[in-house]
């Protein structure tokens, strides 16, 4: 899957673009908005009717090296009495993000962009029921 | 920076950390090509905290299309199909990395950018306080 070229309908390529070898692109990994602090709702993973836990995956050959994944705690959902209701389903909600993968081939190093699917949390859904004959 | 394990036989001149700027292959390695959440599942309709998906498009960014979730209700859908306002539909937000064309409009020069997206909604039981 290649990154699409800039469409002529939007704009012409400026003269100031840096020269890039064919088949590759220049990537600055100094992240824009790196230090912005986001106020995410506290403890929603514990207060949700489809609660989840977080685990951190760490890979030194990936940038960023730390990726947090969520796992639903239950198969069913938590009802008003605090009990699991298995007539409902806790299901993962997923989102793609980009990472940079560093590959070692002998003593040379190459970099590859990779899409990673991250589970961000869980939601409670009504299952679609089929009765098998 | 991030420390990288190195082949012990390699020269020591190699930097252990990710450099600030790298040349990257144009092909993105992935098996998850379906970026339209409406096609990947119908959870957004079947959830007790259902959401609508809004298309956010920016040609200066890769991916150029990102889908943003907005919870349909303040409360959650109960067993009778009515909204229960003693519960909350809350967006699940996630910081993701995208590519921003830098300098602008350049076809093969990018910078990583961190953005906050609402991916879906979940139903939350709030802790209740009565204000004196």
């Amino acid at each position: 899957r290649k990154i699409p070229k800039v469409g002529h309908t939007f704009f012409q390529k400026p003269e100031s673009c840096p020269p890039v070898p064919g088949g590759s692109m220049k990537l600055d990994i100094g992240i824009i908005n790196e230090n912005q602090r986001v106020s995410m709702s506290r403890n929603i993973e514990s207060r949700s009717t489809s609660p989840w836990n977080y685990t951190v995956t760490w890979d030194p050959n990936r940038y960023p090296s730390e990726v947090v994944q969520a796992q639903c705690r239950n198969l069913g959902c938590i009802n008003a009495q605090g009990k699991e209701d298995i007539s409902m389903n806790s299901v993962p909600i997923q989102q793609e993000t980009l990472v940079v993968r560093r590959k070692h081939q002998g003593c040379s190093v190459s970099f590859q962009l990779e899409k990673v699917l991250v589970t961000v949390g869980c939601t409670c859904v009504t299952p679609v029921i089929h009765h098998v004959q | 920076g991030i420390t990288i394990p190195r082949n012990p036989g390699c020269p020591n001149s190699e930097d252990k950390n990710f450099p600030r700027t790298v040349m990257v292959n144009l092909n993105i390695h992935n098996r998850n090509t379906n970026t339209n959440p409406k096609r990947s599942s119908d959870y957004y309709n079947r959830s007790t905290s259902p959401w609508n998906l809004h298309r956010n498009e920016d040609p200066e960014r890769y991916p150029s299309v990102i889908w943003e979730a907005k919870c349909r209700h303040l409360g959650c859908i109960n067993a009778d199909g009515n909204v229960d306002y003693h519960m909350n539909s809350v967006p699940i937000q996630q910081e993701i990395l995208v590519l921003r064309r830098e300098p602008p409009h350049c076809p093969n020069s990018f910078r990583l950018e961190k953005i906050l997206v609402s991916v879906g909604c979940t139903c939350v039981t709030p802790i209740v306080h009565h204000v004196a």
Partner: nanobody
Amino acid sequence: DVQLVESGGGLVQPGGSLRLSCAASGRASSINWMGWFRQAPGKEREFVAGIRWSDAYTEYADSVKGRFTISRDNSKNTVYLQMNSLRPEDTAVYYCVLDLSTVRYWGQGTLVTVSS
């Protein structure tokens, strides 16, 4: 701590109007939504109207749609409920709610009486 100051209740004739307001102060950051519930004598507390802070999305109970309008002032952390064409069945204690997603604060209530 969080404080909620409700005002605007009172006695009004059928067909008349009132405007309730509720100002949140203290640690009222990251507001999810604010709104109003009501409780009539001998009845359960019911949702009336709410407004989401992020995008001003509004929701109303069927019984008040077209008559009541909820609005907000972000800079003042204040929510308003404009109540028109009031009916005797709107008589109740109206409670302001401040919702922070995982924590919800209830005000002490303001009495609205619709009577001739």
